[in-house]
């Protein structure tokens, strides 16, 4: 489906007609005439084809969060445990097992 496709190619649908199409997580560099990795520019350059990828990259570094490709934003796993996507499985399953969440013994 289109959603699955977008999960696998987060920036794939962002490519403009003026640019050459590049593999996932890459952008077209007109000066070099080749596709370049988005990772190289995430910290210092604005590149529209990499915007979603760069945000997802920084989001992955935050514990208990995942990058939602439909919302194009970093979402907290805590708010959706129970109907969570696979990216939150580790967080939500650990949360469930954690004794902190058990009711206090009387």
């Amino acid at each position: 489906s289109r959603v699955d496709q977008e999960e696998r190619f987060p920036q794939g649908l962002w490519t403009g007609v003026a640019m050459r199409s590049c593999p996932e997580e890459q952008y077209w560099d007109p000066l070099l005439g080749t596709c370049m990795s988005c990772k190289t520019i995430c910290n210092h350059q604005s590149q529209r084809t990499c915007a979603a990828f760069c945000r997802s990259l920084s989001c992955r570094k935050e514990q208990g969060k995942f990058y939602d490709h439909l919302l194009r934003d970093c979402i907290s796993c805590a708010s959706i445990c129970g109907q969570h996507p696979k990216q939150c499985a580790y967080f939500c399953e650990n949360k469930l097992r954690s004794p902190v969440n058990l009711p206090p013994e009387l």
Epitope: E6, G16, Q83
Partner: antibody, heavy 118, light 107 residues
Amino acid sequence: EVQLQQSGPELVKPGASVKISCKTSGYTFTEYAMHWVKQSHGKSLEWIGGINPNHGGTSNNQKFKGKATLTVDKSSSTAYMDFRSLTSEDSAVYYCARWGTDPFFAYWGQGTLVTVSA
Amino acid sequence: DIVMTQSHKFMSTSVGDRVSITCKASQDVSTAVAWYQQKPGQSPKLLIYWASTRHTGVPDRFTGSGSGTDYTLTITSVQAEDLTLYYCHQHYAPPWTFGGGTKLEIK
């Protein structure tokens, strides 16, 4: 044909809550995020937040945190926005809006006018 | 948050004229700009996205351009039905923000 049908106008008292609905048709509800946008009389557009219908995760404008709660009912392909502790500042037209394959609003509901008055 | 500034709240024009509505972003939004038209009592309608791509069914007299922080919506030959409100919108990063709007009026 993609359609977003919103609930009718609301006249509410200060301090009360209101729940606006946005019934969708013409597309697969779970494949797109649904967003809500506020437009005060004679003013510009303000993004409130959006929801992913698959798991109910939300992306919010901090300004509306604690004020708006977004939910969905997948069985009826309907999105809802709960707006609480209403004041005169909340009197506005509220739109549900769906973006397409890219993050801009290609489809809009007809708007719901909310009037907060004692 | 990215602030979108439409410096002209009102712009005067005549039918048949060419008019350009401008919008400035507070940071580089890498052509992630959309333009909407809103007629009185109606919902906003998407005209342009990715700064220059015309939405389906939008007449070719509407053209978008720009890059970096500066963006323009141009109507090459203004029609009577175009005399209404226009908003720019950045779809680069959340929170998604809109310009204050520019109203096209008859000269």
